[in-house]
Interface confidence: low
Amino acid sequence: IVLRPSRVHNSEENTMRALTLKDILNGTFSYKTFFPNWISGQEYLHQSADNNIVLYNIETGQSYTILSNRTMKSVNASNYGLSPDRQFVYLESDYSKLWRYSYTATYYIYDLSNGEFVRGNELPRPIQYLCWSPVGSKLAYVYQNNIYLKQRPGDPPFQITFNGRENKIFNGIPDWVYEEEMLATKYALWWSPNGKFLAYAEFNDTDIPVIAYSYYGDEQYPRTINIPYPKAGAKNPVVRIFIIDTTYPAYVGPQEVPVPAMIASSDYYFSWLTWVTDERVCLQWLKRVQNVSVLSICDFREDWQTWDCPKTQEHIEESRTGWAGGFFVSTPVFSYDAISYYKIFSDKDGYKHIHYIKDTVENAIQITSGKWEAINIFRVTQDSLFYSSNEFEEYPGRRNIYRISIGSYPPSKKCVTCHLRKERCQYYTASFSDYAKYYALVCYGPGIPISTLHDGRTDQEIKILEENKELENALKNIQLPKEEIKKLEVDEITLWYKMILPPQFDRSKKYPLLIQVYGGPCSQSVRSVFAVNWISYLASKEGMVIALVDGRGTAFQGDKLLYAVYRKLGVYEVEDQITAVRKFIEMGFIDEKRIAIWGWSYGGYVSSLALASGTGLFKCGIAVAPVSSWEYYASVYTERFMGLPTKDDNLEHYKNSTVMARAEYFRNVDYLLIHGTADDNVHFQNSAQIAKALVNAQVDFQAMWYSDQNHGLSGLSTNHLYTHMTHFLKQCFSLSD
C-alpha cells in the first residue's frame, strides 16, 4: 500500500474535511518543482517568486540578479534566454500558442553590458522560434517559415532559406504531424556544439491533404482553420536535412545531408539529429512502416564542403515483433571518443536496455539487463553514466536514478535515489550541469514532491531547492484518499493497477467503481506519483473507488506486453480493463451495479469500446475527445501501431476497430460523449461520426461540445467539463447532490 508519507494526521477527526470540486478546479493543492537553468558546471539561473532572474553559484554560495523584474515588466516578458557569452538576454513576450509545443512570440534583446535594449536591426514579429548559438551570441530564428541568422544581436540578419510558405514549406520548424508525433518540439534546427554549423529540417507539405474546421470566434462568419494533416494512409510530408556553415553562410550555402539508400527506397521519416562534434553529426531515419530505423553518422568533408555519410557508419535497428523503439526511437548519447555511443533498445529477452555501440549494432555490449527497463540516459561523462529505470523492488511505475561507473572495469552500478526518501520519493527525474559536476533531483511522489541539489561526484545532497511546505500545511486538515499500487496475474499477463480508496474505506462495504483509462501504446498510468486531482475528489468526497489499470500495450514492462497490441489496437487494451474490473468485483467491496469508465483521447476510445463490449459490466461511461476510427488519426502515430489502411495490409482491422461499428452495443449503457470543436489533434469528426452512428442505430446518449476548444479543453471549459462529468457520474451512481 502506498500511503501519502507526508500527510500529518490530526487526532481530531472533525477538523478534517474532504476535498471539494472547487479545490480541484482552483488548483488549491498544486505542487511546485525546481529545475535549475544550468549555465555552467556550477552555475544556474532561476526566476525568483518576484520575477527577478537570479544567477546562483553553487561553489561560492553567492547569488546575484542579472535581470530585474522591472526590465522584464517593461516588455511584459514571460520568458528569457541568456546568451552563452553572458552579454545578452532575449526576452519573450506576446506568447501566442499554436499547437502542443509551438507558439509565436515577440523577442527583445537586452544588452547586459550597458543595461539597454539593443536598438537597430530589431527582430521581426511574431517569431516562430529563436535560439542562441551554444557559444558566443549568434542568433538563429524562424520567421514566416524561413530561417535567419545574426552574427551579433545588433547585426542585420542573413536569410538562410527563401522557400518558406505557410502550410506548404516549413524551414527550421516542424509541420503539424512532425511536431506532435515525431520530434515533440517546436523547433527543427540544431546548432553544432561550438556554433560553427547550423543544421535544419525542411518539411514540404505541398501534397498533404488538409483538415479544415470552423473556428466560430465572435465575428459574423466563422473562420476556417486549415492544417496539412496526413491521416492514416495519406500522403506524408517530404523531409530534407540541410547544414550551413554559420561563419561564412554565403560561401557555399546550405548543404543537404544524404539519406541512407535503404531508407530512401520508399516513404520515410527523419526522426532526430544529434551533433557529435562540430564536424560530425548523427541523423536518425525511419521507414514509413516503422519497424526499421537507421542511425547514420556523417562527417564534414573540408575539401568538398559537403557532408559524407559512409555506409560503414550506418547502424540499423529493426523490430521483428512490433515497431522500432518505444513511443519514439531512442536517441544516442555519444561518448568522448566521438564515435561510440550508448543507446536504449530491446535486448534478446525483449526488455529495453542500455547498449554500448562501438562498431556495429550486432556487436553491441549490453550495459544493463534484467526483467525491467532502462528508461532514459541522462548524461555520460568520462567515468559515469547516469540513467533512470524501474528496476528497484520490481515496481514498473517507479523511476530511480542510477550511476554506472564506466571508467572502471567491471563497471559498477549504484542507485543514487533508491534510499534517499524511500517512502516519500519513488519517482524521480534529474537535471545535470556541465560535466555532471552537480545535478538536481526532482521527486514527483508518491509523497509531496521535493526538488534537491546534489554533488555530481559524491551524490551528497547540498540543499533543498523546493519542498512544497505550503502544500504540506494546506493538506494537514484534508481527508485525502488512500492509494494502493498492486498487481493482478491473469493468464500469464501482469496487470498493474492503482486503486484510489475513500478515506474511511471499509472492505466490508460496497462502493461504486470508476475506471480511469488511457491505455495508449507505450503509455503508463500506474505511476508512483503525487496528485490531488478530480479522481482524488471523487474518492474523498463522493466515496467512489477509482482504479487505473495498465494492460497490454502499455510501457516499461517488456516487449511482450508492449507489442501485444501491434496491428490490432482496440482489442487487448479493452479486454484487460474488463478483466481487471471482474477481478475488482471478486475483491468483494465493489457494487457490481455501479461501475463506470472514463477516458480522454486514446482513453476515450478505450472507454467507448469497453462500454460497447456487451459485457454488461458498466452502467455508464464518459469519452472525452475520443478517437473513433484509426482512419481519422495522424499517419505517423497510427501507422506505427496499425500498419496501413490498405486491403493488402491492415484495412480489415482498421474497419473492425471503430467505435461506430459497435453503435448497437451502447443501448444498455449511459454514454456521455464530449469533444472540443477546434481540436487540431483528434478532430471533432471522430465524435461527429460516433454521434451519427448512435442516432442511426436509434441509441440514446448524452453529449457536450466545447466551442472553439482544442484537445486540452482548457480555461473555463475545464471547470465546465469536470462539473458536467461530476453530475453525470453522481446521477449514474445515484449519489445525492
Epitope: K568, G570, Y572, E575, A661
Partner: nanobody, 122 residues
C-alpha cells in the same frame, strides 16, 4: 436469430488428429471455437473472419487450423498432434462484429452452438 450446428469431435489417442465443423444459419462476420474443460473457464481456441483473418490461442498455434467456407457459412477446425490437455467440450461461436475474433472472453460473443465433446486419451 442465428443458429449454429456443430458436428465432429469424439475420442482420439494422444498425438492423433480430429476435426470439428460448424454451420451457421445466416451469414456472419466472425466465427470461432471455444473450449471448456471440467471446472475451467470457457477459453478461445481459434477464430476467423469472413475475410479469412485468423486468431489462435498460443496453446494451439501450429497444431490447430481454422478455416471457413463463406458460401456454406461453415467454419472448420482441424486439430493435429492432440494432447490430453486438449480434452474439453468444444463450442462453436459466432458474432456479427469482425473485431470479435480477438475477444477471448466468451461473454463477448453473441451466438453459440450446443457443444461437442473432444476426448484425448493418453
Amino acid at each position: 436469430q442465428v443458429q449454429l450446428q456443430e458436428s465432429g469431435g469424439g475420442l482420439v489417442q494422444a498425438g492423433g488428429s480430429l476435426s470439428v465443423s460448424c454451420a451457421a444459419s445466416g451469414s456472419i462476420f466472425s466465427m470461432g471455437w471455444f473450449r471448456q474443460a471440467p471446472g475451467k473457464q470457457r477459453e478461445l481456441v481459434a477464430a476467423v473472419t469472413s475475410g479469412g483473418v485468423t486468431n489462435y490461442a498460443d496453446s494451439v498455434k501450429g497444431r490447430f487450423t481454422i478455416s471457413r467456407d463463406n458460401a456454406k457459412n461453415t467454419v472448420y477446425l482441424q486439430m493435429k498432434s492432440l494432447k490430453p490437455e486438449d480434452t474439453a467440450v468444444y463450442y462453436c461461436a459466432a458474432d456479427s462484429s469482425r473485431g470479435k475474433i480477438y475477444f477471448s472472453n466468451y461473454r463477448s460473443w453473441n451466438y453459440w452452438g450446443q457443444g461437442t465433446q473432444v476426448t484425448v486419451s493418453s
